[in-house]
């Protein structure tokens, strides 16, 4: 025979073709072998001009031989070489699919590989590629878009060889709250790390507000609206500054009375105050908390105390906010001016968390009267709020 060629090569099959001998022959003897593969020999009819090679090893160079037989006579042997394709990984699956994450898993191909090429694409045409190592059989996808169809494909690599791609299709789950109106909704969306988040007042995407979320204290989901920790920020500010907010939300800051009014107008909120001083801690929780609008001069409502710090906020309940340039307290003197801060002063305060940091003079410092009195300025203080029904929402999410 002559003109031995191979065609239709895959990772496990190939088709051998040849030109028949000029003389009539009884049979052809075909043999093929590869590195680490024992030789296989097959005899086929003398009028056959092709033979399907099966059960081949992937990514293997084979040597194929053929000769003709007629009675006791044998023709000379002709030879061809071919290399099977790299076989594909198997069983690509997307599991643990969340709103922004998914886990891809697969089984490795039979052939040894030098790595894998992962490609994932969303319906909007966003394509991302990543190459992972040869021993990897799973990969966590992150920063996905919620409620989005994705096609994930994987291809094995071995030097210049590339397998066929296999694919799987999955859809990320929708966010419970696409535009979270507070940190509790951000948390129910699956965000469990404390830090900066964007919330949307009344769930309106045009009303974005960057806030610091405390996702750890008492179950998390708190919008922090005041932090004192080192005295670097000046809290002896005017009415306009307290209305708008000031400071660095990762450090010392005040979120702003306008923001507090808008947030607490969204529903029933609770207040938590966390205090720390020289290794001691205390907290106060009020199950009803709201701040009125500018017309009420941001009137405070705070009721339903529990905690370890003592009920110092009750004294301030029903009071309007006061600053040195807008005196709304019930004292003859200006409380904000007298005590170098700002608060929902009455005459004057049991709480002065916006007082002078580190000032232990009577009533001048960061005070929470029923914990450390008026002659000790507290080192660390945070005020934060979340929906009063957060526990119910959290339980519902866990059941879901």
């Amino acid at each position: 025979p002559s003109g031995l060629v191979t065609a239709n090569i895959t990772d496990s099959e190939a088709l051998a073709r040849w030109q028949p001998a000029i003389a009539t022959v009884d049979s052809y003897v075909i043999s093929y072998t590869g590195e680490k593969v024992p030789e296989i020999t097959r005899t086929v009819s003398g009028n056959t001009v092709e033979y399907a090679l099966t059960d081949l090893e992937p990514a293997t160079e084979y040597t194929l031989r053929i000769f003709a037989e007629k009675g006791p006579q044998k023709s000379s042997t002709i030879t061809a070489k071919f290399t099977t394709d790299l076989d594909s990984p198997r069983d690509l699956t997307a599991t643990e699919v969340q709103s922004e994450t998914a886990l891809l898993t697969w089984r490795p191909p039979r052939a040894s590989v030098t790595g894998y090429l992962l490609v994932y694409e969303s319906v909007d045409g966003t394509v991302k590629e990543v190459i992972v190592g040869p021993d990897t059989t799973s990969y966590s996808l992150a920063d996905l878009s919620p409620s989005t169809h994705y096609t994930a494909k994987i291809q094995a690599l071995n030097g210049p060889l590339r397998s066929n791609m296999i694919q799987t299709i999955f859809t990320t789950i929708g966010l419970l709250y696409p535009f979270p109106k507070d940190c509790s909704q951000a948390m129910l969306n699956g965000d469990t790390t404390s830090g900066l988040y964007t919330i949307y007042l009344n769930g309106d995407k045009a009303e974005a507000l960057e806030v610091f979320c405390d996702m750890t204290s008492d179950g998390g989901g708190w919008i922090v609206f005041l932090r004192r920790k080192n005295g670097r920020e000046n809290f002896y500010q005017n009415w306009k500054a307290y209305a708008a907010g000031f400071g660095d939300r990762r450090e010392e800051f005040w979120l702003g009375l306008d923001n507090l009014n808008k947030i607490t107008a969204q529903g029933q909120y609770e207040l938590r105050v966390d205090l720390r001083d020289h290794g001691e801690t205390a907290f106060a929780v009020y199950d009803k908390f709201s701040v009125g609008d500018a017309k009420t001069r941001y009137k405070l409502k705070v009721e339903g105390y529990s905690g370890t710090a003592g009920d110092s906020m009750a004294y301030h309940n029903g009071r309007s906010f006061s600053t040195f340039d807008k005196d709304t307290d019930s004292a003859i003197t200006n409380c904000a001016l007298s005590y170098k801060g700002a608060f929902w002063y009455r005459n004057c305060h049991r709480v002065n968390l916006m007082g002078r940091y580190g000032d232990n003079n009577h009533s001048q410092g960061v005070n929470w009267f029923h914990w450390k009195g008026h002659e000790h300025s507290i080192q660390f203080a945070e005020m934060k709020l979340r929906p009063s029904n957060f526990r119910n929402l959290e339980g519902r999410r866990k059941r879901a």
């Epitope: 529990s306 009920d311 004294y315 004292a331």
Partner: antibody
Amino acid sequence: QVQLVESGGGLVQPGRSLRLSCAASGFTFDDYAMHWVRQAPGKGLEWVSGISGSGGSTYYADSVKGRFTISRDNAKNSLYLQMNSLRAEDTALYYCAKVMSSMEDAFDIWGQGTMVTVSS
Amino acid sequence: DIQMTQSPSSLSASVGDRVTITCRASQYIQGFLNWYQQKPGKAPKLLIYDASNLETGVPSRFSGSGSGTDFTLTISSLQPEDFATYYCQQSYSTPQTFGQGTKVDIK
């Protein structure tokens, strides 16, 4: 209208017990801390005891600590003062009083008082 | 405990007189000071809270001032119904304490 009415006073021998009650009406009782204040005959006012709106926190003057117990039943809008081991110096007119807002605050509503006389 | 000292302990005045009663706290109490009026056989009545705020229904001839440790109750023009005993009270901390009282009688 807002009203406090005390009852339970009377003549009692030293060492014995007495329980005073105060019935409240006209306001949301459990929103407010309540106090007992006493006035010995011909003398000034002396704060005796106080209790938070929920009943979770209680406070006593040193002179009655360990002998008197303040309590409240918010379902019944009632305040109580259990007085044990009574002494002659406990003889006084006992008033219950409502605070304006917080535990330590002005007393804006007072009852008419109930007289306790400790004598053998 | 915070001691409250009132002066004078008694005073005689005529209708129309301006009367001033002072109250001193043994320690700094911001403006946590209240004034009460008590007539014989009656319960005390709140007049002034937070040192200077007039309780609802109290005539405007009564006024309060002061902060820190020194406080004053002033009756601008004494009326017949004002003859009574007046008490100051600190609500700064527990135990809340009262002054010993100032008796205002007719001259």
